[in-house]
Interface confidence: medium
């Protein structure tokens, strides 16, 4: 059986101030179990966007309904972009784990730019 | 009902290191982004730094930077701010702040802790 | 850096008059801006936040306006437990998150 593949498609996304960005992110397989979770950047400073299975994150929306059986989309939308959200957004999933989920795989990353509103 | 609840501050001589605590409850402190700010006395609200959900993404006042280490444990409930190297600038009331979202507003503000640093 | 001014430093308003609190950036940060209350010796305290929204238990009295680089916070009616530092604080751009200077409430 193939191993799980995590896929960006968008290596770069353009958004102008105040609208939405979607960020695409595809799995391959639905093992291993586990949740995924959205960060900006990379490494130790990452900063957690979403977290599948717990948090507070009133700006993300998810694509589609991700607790749906089968499902491999979990491509989330931000709302009311602002220059601060600039940065590289990882798609990162995690095995299920006792006591904490261990990572994975990441996808390669997607890079979103912040355009200034237009006048 | 929120509540954030700050301990450690004292007065200590220039040079040495002093360590702050927030104890929160009334929320899911893990699913929320931290901060400290600072007020000098007579003066106005100052930044200090901030800490995501996750703990791994961290930011810092210029001010502070290379000085201060924000970190939290989110089995205890409660954020830390690391002083060291303490400068008689650095003498404020620290205060804690919940952040609404990962980029967003300070919705709730903890009573403060008075941190002296004077020969 | 974005910065904000707040003005006037201070405004002393009779009870049951309109107080009127202006911040302007020096750039734009579109509809993130927070308007924070600290009475004092206490902590401070948010009242509105994406420039015109009141935080939970605010009273009507309090309302904020504006967007990009010029904003209001107005309090209709002033009461006597009004009197505070108010400061206004944005989240457009960060870090560092920046507040205002503050503008001191007196009751005449």
């Known amino acids: 059986e193939d191993e799980l593949q995590v896929i960006q498609p968008e290596k770069s996304v353009s958004v102008a101030a105040g609208e939405s960005a979607t960020l695409r992110c595809a799995m391959t397989s639905l093992i291993p179990v586990g949740p995924i979770m959205w960060f900006r950047g990379a490494g130790a400073g990452r900063e957690l966007i979403y977290n599948q299975k717990e948090g507070h994150f009133p700006r993300v929306t998810t694509v589609s309904e991700l607790t749906k059986r089968n499902n491999l989309d979990f491509s989330i939308s931000i709302s009311n972009i602002t220059p601060a959200d600039a940065g590289t957004y990882y798609c990162v999933k995690f095995r299920k784990g006792s006591p904490d989920d261990v990572e994975f795989k990441s996808g390669a990353g997607t890079e979103l730019s912040v355009r200034a509103k237009p006048s | 009902d929120v509540q954030l609840v700050e301990s450690g501050g004292g007065v200590v001589r220039p040079g040495e290191s002093l360590r702050l605590s927030c104890a929160a409850s009334g929320f899911s402190f893990r699913s929320y982004a931290m901060n400290w700010v600072r007020q000098a006395p007579g003066e106005g609200l100052e930044w200090v730094s901030r800490?995501?959900?996750?703990?791994?993404?961290?930011d810092y006042a210029d001010s502070v930077k290379g000085r201060f280490t924000i970190s939290r444990d989110n089995s205890k409930n409660t954020l830390y701010l690391q002083m060291n190297s303490l400068r008689a600038e650095d003498t404020a009331v620290y205060y804690c702040a919940k952040q609404y979202d990962w980029n967003s507003f300070f919705d709730y503000w903890g009573l403060g802790a008075p941190v002296t640093v004077s020969s | 850096e974005t910065v904000l001014t707040q003005s006037p430093a201070t405004l002393s308003v009779s009870p049951g008059e309109r107080a009127t609190l202006s911040c302007r950036a020096s750039?734009?940060?579109?509809?993130?801006l927070a308007w924070h209350q600290q009475k004092p010796g206490q902590a401070p305290r948010l009242l509105i936040y994406d420039a015109s929204n009141r935080a939970t238990g605010i009273p009507d009295r309090f309302s904020g306006s504006g967007s990009g680089t010029d904003f209001t916070l107005t309090i209709s009616s002033l009461q006597t437990e009004d009197s505070a530092v108010y400061y206004c604080q944005q989240y457009y751009y960060w870090p560092p998150y920046r507040f205002g200077g503050g503008t001191k409430v007196e009751i005449k």
């Open positions: 800490i995501d959900s996750g703990g791994g993404g961290t």
């Open positions: 750039q734009t940060v579109g509809s993130k």
